[in-house]
Interface confidence: low
């Protein structure tokens, strides 16, 4: 039986410092119920970048209207990129619960930061 897929089509993205980075993520189903979250890094040290149900996240905007009930595009744009933003970003589907529990992760997108052009 085929499972929900989380598609992060870009293995890597390179952005100049000061610019915005777009990280793509789409899901293949609305099921199971629960939010999408973005993290930088993996494991216990990972950093929350965006949570569909929390906020605000001042530097993060969603590319699509994620409040639209049938939305399946959870791509994000991170503004004013700095070298500290470099790392691998994971789009992760959570199952709604008490608390929400991690259901499935995308494969990750590595963000590298180029020096700001002079």
């Amino acid at each position: 039986e085929e499972e929900l897929q989380i598609i992060q089509p870009d293995k890597s993205v390179s952005v100049a410092a000061g610019e915005s980075a777009i990280l793509h993520c789409t899901i293949t189903s609305l099921f199971p119920v629960g939010p999408i979250q973005w993290f930088r890094g993996a494991g216990p040290a990972r950093v929350l970048i965006y949570n569909q149900r929390q906020g605000p996240f001042p530097r993060v905007t969603t590319v699509s209207e994620t409040t639209k009930r049938e939305n399946m595009d959870f791509s994000i744009s991170i503004s004013n990129i700095t070298p500290a933003d470099a790392g691998t970003y994971y789009c992760i589907k959570f199952r709604k619960g008490s608390p929400d529990t991690e259901f499935k992760s995308g494969a990750g997108t590595e963000l590298s930061v180029r020096a700001k052009p002079s």
Partner: antibody, heavy 118, light 108 residues
Framework: DVQLVESGGGVVRPGESLRLSCAAS????????MSWVRQGPGEGLEWVAG????????WYADSVKGRFTISRDNSKNTLYLRLFSLRTEDTAIYYC???????????WGLGTLVTVSS | EIVLTQSPGTLSLSPGETATLSCRAS??????LAWYQQKPGQAPRLLIY???SRATGIPDRFSGSGSGTDFTLTISSLQSEDFAVYYC??????????FGGGTKVEIK
Amino acid sequence: DVQLVESGGGVVRPGESLRLSCAASGFTFSDHDMSWVRQGPGEGLEWVAGISLRGGVTWYADSVKGRFTISRDNSKNTLYLRLFSLRTEDTAIYYCARESWNTFFDYWGLGTLVTVSS
Amino acid sequence: EIVLTQSPGTLSLSPGETATLSCRASQNVRSNLAWYQQKPGQAPRLLIYDASSRATGIPDRFSGSGSGTDFTLTISSLQSEDFAVYYCQQYGNGPPLTFGGGTKVEIK
């Protein structure tokens, strides 16, 4: 107006097969996960199978797993359910139901009756 | 699989009275619960979703409450058209999506 019209029911013998169809109109079919829900004579409601809006992900109740196949053709706005190896306990009205964003059912068809009898 | 238990099985009331229907989940489903009404020979109709939100076109005499494992559907001032079978359904976990066994509201 949203309309769901099931067809394909009938009387079959145990072990035989059927294909049910559900013609959808009045909404953007490809924006919604869809399900089949059945109701045995004098019984309650039982969710049978569900399919993601693009058809890439399917889910089944344990009672029908391996015997029923749900599919959809978004170009025809039609949902299908193939019923194989039918048993007498599969006798029921089969309803096609549109899933809302949170996997409850906001619109239902009138149902099609499947009778499995020797 | 989450089991939903509805009580009572049958509720005998007169028009104008208030019906109180219960649905209990075997696990926490937060507010992910819907209520449906079904009349003989008809398909179910969505009444309440997210435990307490009325679906489009549903009269305000229907109200839902509860979260976690205990939920209530209240029908105030019963009308003749309200006598039917009512089902709860959880979508806080799954698949499978599960329904309660139903409560029949009949005329006393």
